[in-house]
């Protein structure tokens, strides 16, 4: 168990020109706060529970009023720190989402106005007990400069916190109800394996299997305090008959349970059974209502005010999970049709066509000839992955918009002239060639040396 | 016919406020995204923000944030809402239509990506 | 966010001419550009979307290609009513999350 914190540094206009002078419009004042959500491994985007390691709301900034034309100040930022408490392993590698939004302090009909400023997200590699990490975040015109840092609850240590720090020489060593018991990594590593039941708190074993007291605790098992009463004289470890010292603190001593949550002994630690309305691992964490803003990313939260009530979160189209803090991996029905690239805009999709494709989902093929025009009396051809014009006379180009000279393939032969027209081109034969191309001679006695003719033409005839 | 009028527009001072209206009229509002652009004289159009009529989702330039609001105020109109007016906000603000479309049983809606439909603009000229 | 660039600045051409004007995308947008023409004291007409798909009501002498980053609208057969400026644009998706609209510079297209 332990507890990751967040502190937020700054949050203002990001460097470069366009930025806002501040969030708060000039009419109205307003205050900032903070949400973060963590979860495990993999990238914020991942479908995977919401905020599994938890999520946590700041408290409300101080009132901030825009002042025209003055220059604009550091934003005033909530007290204290973001903590997000986690029950079990801290899993080394973690993804988290911060937001940042605006309470608009006006005479709104039903209260303050929310506005989601700035929404950053990241992955980061972060060992328990380590420094705090420093990082800066941009979101659009906004720039983010926070801290965070995870650390263990005692008695977990290590990068994981699934260490637990039990005293494994003597306990004059350690001294009594001391649970990290001391600083030397050696009497930090994972326990010995006592016996069954061994108190976590109040007992240790040398060897496996044992259960040994510490002062003041007796049983088996070492969870019954020793009556003061019984006690004679300062001993070492004590067994369940000999004298003792004052009894050490219970894991329960003094109610470890915040916010009226009762406290109940377990074999490695203590449980709090918290009321309605609390959670946590002390039961710190006060419930969530619709008034602490749950929902992420414009969710709209319905129920109840008060702290017995759940809330439900109705998501916007792209979002999902309890708290709407999953994005939706809408593209991966493949909504695109014919190759296309889909965009998940949060709103709605947006597909990119390939070539020769076009329509909101890529399903118009261009390649067929609708909606394409040949100019100059070309004909469209389908195919090929492009449409193609077959022109008319005269004219060439992909739509039949450029203007051809049909003289330029030298189309006539034996030494014919060739004149362009307006229904494409005349050959002026020299004497001794006919045809529309001048290609056949003409012999002496006038007859030609044409092919068989085809039927319904009578040799002589001209051919076009 | 479809139509877009946009209004509000005008002389202002230097850091003033103001606020545009563009109404609509002859089309379904909804499954549309209703956008501002503005276009200075002898400029190209530069497009500021759009909101979209389904779900009320509002997208702007990141040069627009924090001083270009956009929002639904009708079935048939939106508004944009511009502070701490400069001489560089002198322009003709045009409102224009970005149509969305939608298909049976699809859950999400599909951009389009263009503007098929503008209004005549209104001219707003920031000068003291 | 993206950048669209246009070129030339400016054209001049006969009637019954053709002009060709030129629109690059800083990065790769597939078939997403729109055309659009201008006026003066008008706003802005959709002619073309998807890179070539003529808007209903537009003549088809104005045809547009291209893809990836390199677009083009082409006007033949000019007349004395295309003279106008012409714009292209597409839209954009930042890895930010960013969701918006760019427009290239314009192109003066004046006719003799």
């Known amino acids: 168990a332990g507890v990751f914190e967040l502190q937020i540094h700054s949050f203002g206009p990001g460097p470069g020109p366009g930025a806002p002078r501040s969030p708060c419009s000039a009419r109205l004042p307003c205050r900032l706060f903070f949400r973060v959500c963590l979860k495990p491994g993999l990238s914020e985007e991942a479908a995977e529970s919401p905020c599994a390691l938890g999520a946590a709301l700041s408290a409300r900034g101080p009132v901030y009023t825009e002042q025209p034309g003055a220059p604009a100040p550091d934003l005033p930022l909530p007290d204290g720190l973001l903590q997000v408490p986690f029950r079990d392993a801290w899993p080394g590698t973690f993804s988290f989402i911060i937001e940042t939004w605006r309470e608009e302090l006006g005479d709104q009909i039903g209260g303050p106005a929310w506005s989601l400023l700035a929404r950053v997200a990241g992955r980061r590699r972060l060992a328990a007990g380590g420094p705090w990490a420093r990082d800066i975040q941009r979101a659009g015109a906004w720039e983010l400069r926070f801290s965070y840092r995870a650390r263990c609850e005692p008695p977990a240590v290590g990068t994981a916190c699934t260490r637990l720090c039990r005293p494994r020489s003597a306990p004059s060593r350690c001294g009594p109800g001391l649970r990290p018991c001391a600083p030397l990594e050696d009497e930090c590593e994972a326990p010995l394996v006592c016996r069954a039941g061994c108190s976590p708190e109040h007992g240790f074993c040398e060897q496996p299997g044992e259960c040994r007291c510490l002062e003041g605790w007796t049983g088996p098992l070492c969870t019954v305090p020793v009556s003061t009463s019984s006690c004679l004289s300062p001993r070492g470890p004590s067994s369940a008959t000999t004298g003792c010292l004052v009894p050490g603190p219970g894991p329960c001593d003094g109610n470890p349970c915040a916010n009226g949550g009762s406290c109940s002994e377990t074999p490695r630690s203590f449980e709090c059974t918290c009321p309605r309305g609390f959670y946590g691992l002390r039961c710190e964490v006060s419930g969530v209502t619709c008034a602490d803003g749950p929902c992420f990313n414009g969710g709209l939260c319905v129920g109840g005010a008060d702290p017995d009530s759940a809330y439900i979160c109705h998501c916007p189209p792209g979002f999902q999970g309890s708290n709407c803090e999953k994005r939706v991996d809408r593209c991966s029905l493949q909504p695109c049709r014919n190759g296309g690239l889909c965009l998940d805009l949060g709103h709605a999709l947006r597909c990119r066509c390939r070539a020769g494709f076009a329509g909101p989902r890529c399903e118009h093929d261009l390649d067929d000839c609708a909606g394409r025009a040949c100019a100059n009396g070309g004909t469209c051809v389908e195919g090929g992955g492009a449409h193609r014009c077959s022109c008319a006379l005269g004219f060439g180009g992909r739509d039949c918009r450029e203007r051809a000279d049909p003289c330029a393939a030298r189309p006539c032969a034996h030494g014919g002239r060739c004149y362009a027209h307006f229904s494409g081109l005349v050959c002026a034969c020299a004497p001794g060639y006919m045809g529309a191309r001048c290609e056949f001679p003409v012999h002496p006695d006038g007859a030609s040396a044409l092919p068989a003719a085809p039927p319904g033409l009578r040799p002589g005839d001209p051919q076009r | 016919q479809e139509q877009l009028v946009e209004s509000g527009g005008g002389l202002v001072q230097p850091g003033a406020s103001l606020t545009l209206t563009c109404k609509a009229s002859g089309f379904d509002f909804t499954s549309n995204a209703m956008c501002w652009v503005r276009q200075a004289p002898g400029k190209g159009p530069e497009w500021i923000a759009c909101i979209y009529n389904d779900d009320g989702s509002a997208y702007s330039a990141s040069w627009a944030k924090g001083r270009f609001t956009v929002s639904k105020t009708s079935s048939t109109a939106v508004t944009l809402q511009v502070t701490g007016l400069t001489a560089a906000d002198t322009a003709t603000y045009f409102c224009?239509?970005?149509?969305?479309?939608?298909?049976?049983?699809?859950?999400?809606?599909?951009?389009?990506?263009?503007?098929?439909?503008w209004g005549p603009g209104t001219l707003v000229t920031v000068s003291s | 966010d993206i950048v669209m660039t246009q070129t030339p600045a400016s054209v001049e051409a006969a009637v019954g001419g053709t002009v060709t004007i030129k629109c690059q995308a800083s990065?790769?947008?597939?078939?997403?550009l729109a055309w659009y023409q201008q006026k003066p004291g008008q706003p802005p007409k959709l002619l073309m979307h998807?890179?070539?798909v003529l808007t209903s009501g537009v003549p088809s002498r104005f045809s547009g290609s291209g893809y990836g980053t390199e677009f083009t609208l082409t006007i033949s057969d000019l007349e004395c009513a295309d003279a106008a400026t012409y714009y292209c644009?597409?839209?954009?998706?930042?890895?930010?999350?960013?969701?918006?609209?760019?427009f290239g510079g314009g192109t003066e297209v004046v006719v003799k």
């Open positions: 998807d890179a070539s």
């Open positions: 644009q597409s839209d954009y998706y930042s890895t930010g999350g960013s969701y918006g609209f760019a």
């Open positions: 990065e790769n947008i597939y078939n997403s």
């Open positions: 224009a239509r970005s149509p969305y479309y939608t298909y049976g049983g699809a859950p999400s809606a599909y951009a389009s990506g263009y503007f098929n439909l």
